[in-house]
Interface confidence: low
């Protein structure tokens, strides 16, 4: 018979015959012949293959490397990748997320709309008209101003958006 | 029991160099990343070398104050570490601490030391 | 290179007294990266207190880490005369790795 030009799926064409690729988690150790299949072996630990494959050498693990504010999300298997993730406080700066940063925190007249993920930075939005924030944060919001009448106040000093209004004693005539 | 043993100190003259070495024994070795620290005499502490395991392909690092003049490796079969030192200084004069560095995922610190062994540089 | 600045360098204190010492790095780490360390005279260093507040091992509980950013300490909460060491701060966070410059405490 002819030989083949082209291999079914999870084979590969060698010296003119289709050989098994070697499965997720396994690396070729010998092609296959006339007379034998295609020889695997197991990836060994901190290692791994994630396809269907005829690699003779396993992948490394990535390693979530501290000095990069990295950490395990999760662990690698023989057929998958270590995930890193951030250090809290910090995001990465990439989506293979190969290194991290602190997250930014909002100024004073600014608060948070959004905290901040393991993969995304913090948002800011300036404080509107009758909100404040007087802190530098990566977690406040703006806060209301405080309703003076509520407390049968009254407004002494107007707030801003990066102070709160300041509430008296009303004025009583006498009598 | 974990065990940490340094030799190889001694006095040695200015220009010259040494081999310092670290047996050990009592916990896994083979994974751990494995560091030299110094100190001299009345001083404080100084990291100096660290070599990681087979995982990371034994990469290796340096402090940059003896950058070229260093080498630092590793013999998993017999659970050693090894710190050459080259062109010796007066300043290179301190006990050597050889230390293992714990890692989890989370964080690094130095978990087992050596007793140390005391180099001295002098003519 | 972070620079981690310790103080006291030196402090003498009375058995039963609260001590502090505190660590102050040049640049923001995570607390995950800060490290103390005690040394007895004579002796090799080991590991007190690891990611600014988990105790060691075998550490007695009156010891005790906090902090944050760049500001870190070891709080001993009643001082003892086993106590007499020096004490280091360390960062993992970036290579070099680096120590404080070592607190000494002394009992009076």
């Known amino acids: 018979p002819e030989p083949p030009t082209a291999c079914r799926e999870k084979q590969y064409l060698i010296n003119s015959q289709c050989c098994s690729l070697c499965q997720p988690g396994q690396k070729l150790v010998s092609d296959c012949t006339e007379f034998t299949e295609t020889e695997c072996l197991p990836c060994g630990e901190s290692e791994f293959l994630d396809t269907w494959n005829r690699e003779t050498h396993c992948h490394q693990h990535k390693y979530c490397d501290p000095n990069l504010g990295l950490r395990v999300q999760q662990k690698g298997t023989s057929e998958t990748d270590t995930i890193c993730t951030c250090e809290e406080g910090w995001h990465c700066t990439s989506e293979a997320c190969e290194s991290c940063v602190l997250h930014r925190s909002c100024s004073p007249g600014f608060g948070v709309k959004q905290i901040a993920t393991g993969v995304s930075d913090t948002i800011c939005e300036p404080c509107p008209v009758g909100f404040f924030s007087n802190v530098s944060s990566a977690f406040e919001k703006c806060h209301p101003w405080t309703s003076c009448e509520t407390k049968d106040l009254v407004v002494q000093q107007a707030g801003t958006n990066k102070t709160d209004v300041v509430c008296g004693p009303q004025d009583r005539l006498r009598a | 029991e974990v065990q940490i043993l340094e030799t190889g100190g001694g006095l040695v003259k200015p220009g010259g160099s040494l081999r310092l070495s670290c047996a050990t024994s009592?916990?896994?070795?083979?994974?751990?990343?494995m560091n030299w620290v110094r100190q001299a005499p009345g001083k404080g502490l100084e990291w100096v070398a660290q070599i990681r395991n087979k995982n990371y392909n034994y990469a290796t690092y340096y402090t940059e104050s003896l950058e070229g003049r260093v080498t630092i490796s590793r013999d998993d079969s017999k659970s050693r570490v090894y710190l050459q030192v080259s062109s010796l200084r007066a300043e290179d004069s301190a006990v050597y601490y050889c230390?293992?560095?714990?890692?989890?995922?989370?964080?690094?610190?130095?978990?087992?030391w050596g007793q140390g062994v005391m180099v001295t540089v002098s003519s | 290179e972070i620079v981690l600045t310790q103080s006291p360098t030196t402090m003498a204190a009375s058995p039963g007294e609260k001590i502090t010492i505190t660590c102050s790095a040049s640049s923001s780490i995570s607390s995950n990266y800060l490290h103390w360390y005690q040394q007895k005279p004579g002796s090799s260093p080991k590991v007190l207190i690891y990611?600014?507040?988990n105790l060691a091992s075998g550490v007695p509980v009156r010891f005790s880490g906090s902090g944050s950013g760049t500001s870190y300490s070891l709080t001993i909460g009643t001082m003892e005369a086993e106590d007499v060491a020096t004490y280091y701060c360390?960062?993992?966070?970036?290579?070099?790795?680096?120590f404080g410059g070592g607190t000494k405490l002394e009992i009076k």
């Open positions: 009592g916990f896994n070795f083979n994974d751990s990343f």
């Open positions: 360390q960062q993992g966070s970036s290579i070099p790795y680096t």
């Open positions: 990611r600014t507040s």
């Open positions: 230390t293992s560095y714990y890692y989890d995922g989370f964080a690094d610190y130095f978990d087992y």
